[in-house]
């Protein structure tokens, strides 16, 4: 199957724009706009910090760690109430991301 110019292959995404919201003090919110052509049962999400089509249930049930959000070799843990996740580096440093 041939794709027309600007058409995305099923199950893929591309980044369109990247802008930052500085309205909330002490919090950095990066807004990345992506265009995705997701298959049935998938929605636009993230895998390894890149836009990707992911199983809709992962996001709806907030199972963030199933989206491979941490780097290879890092451990992923859900925050209380699944409000985000932490990535634990091999040496024990943690990086926390919250989802509003």
């Amino acid at each position: 199957q041939f794709l027309k110019e600007g058409q995305l292959a099923a199950g893929t995404c591309e980044i369109v724009t990247l802008d930052r919201d500085s309205s909330q003090p002490r919090r950095t919110i990066a807004r990345q706009t992506a265009r995705c052509a997701c298959r049935k049962g998938q929605i636009a999400g993230t895998t390894r910090a890149r836009p990707a089509c992911v199983d809709a249930r992962i996001i709806l049930q907030r199972w963030w760690c199933q989206m491979e959000l941490c780097l290879e070799g890092e451990g992923c843990d859900l925050l209380i109430n699944r409000s985000g996740w932490t990535c634990t580096q091999p040496g024990g440093r943690i990086k926390t991301t919250t989802v509003s």
Epitope: G91, R93, T96
Partner: antibody, heavy 114, light 113 residues
Framework: QEQLVESGGRLVTPGTTLTLTCTVS????????VSWVRQAPGKGLEWIGY??????PHYASWAKGRFTISKTSSTTVDLKMTSLTTEDTATYFC?????????WGPGTLVTVSS | ELDLTQTPSSVSAAVGGTVTINCQAS????????LAWYQQKPGQPPKLLIY???TLASGVSSRFKGSGSGTQFTLTISDVQCDDAATYYC?????????????FGGGTELEIL
Amino acid sequence: QEQLVESGGRLVTPGTTLTLTCTVSGFSLSSYGVSWVRQAPGKGLEWIGYIANNYNPHYASWAKGRFTISKTSSTTVDLKMTSLTTEDTATYFCARDNYGMDPWGPGTLVTVSS
Amino acid sequence: ELDLTQTPSSVSAAVGGTVTINCQASQSVYNNKNLAWYQQKPGQPPKLLIYAASTLASGVSSRFKGSGSGTQFTLTISDVQCDDAATYYCQGEFSCSSADCNAFGGGTELEIL
């Protein structure tokens, strides 16, 4: 609002042991790491060490042995300093260490003098 | 031993000008991009400007731009303002399992002419 405040800094004599406390509010120490950083008068920033929940603290090579970082409650992290010398005179800061260090406490001044 | 070399140690700029500060690490930072930049004014704690080499922290002017990866990083301040007079520090993150977790550069003092 996320905040850190250091306390315990004072004038001490060489050889003294001193413990500084970093009290946090607005975020959970179970989800974030904290670093201690010091700055001698008119000098640059010097990283001392880092602690994350449920993990052993990590120290700068020069700080190992004389400095101890511990999480003492759900809202406090201590920095214990032994055998203080005049070279340890500095403002001591704690900071939430996540994607960069932010926010920082205002700092607490430790003066070591005979 | 981990080392972050910041150059120059001091720099002067006119209002409206552009300033470039360099930071070189003795080994690659974690994930090749875990480097932050801070601004510090006398009597105040440092303020985070940029993290992950190029991501602007909340509320920071877009006149501040970070770039680089691995061991070489740059902070560029464009359209310099009087309020930018301060000391700037780079801070690298390294794997805690093999070395010091963090290290700071020696600082660059910016004077506005």
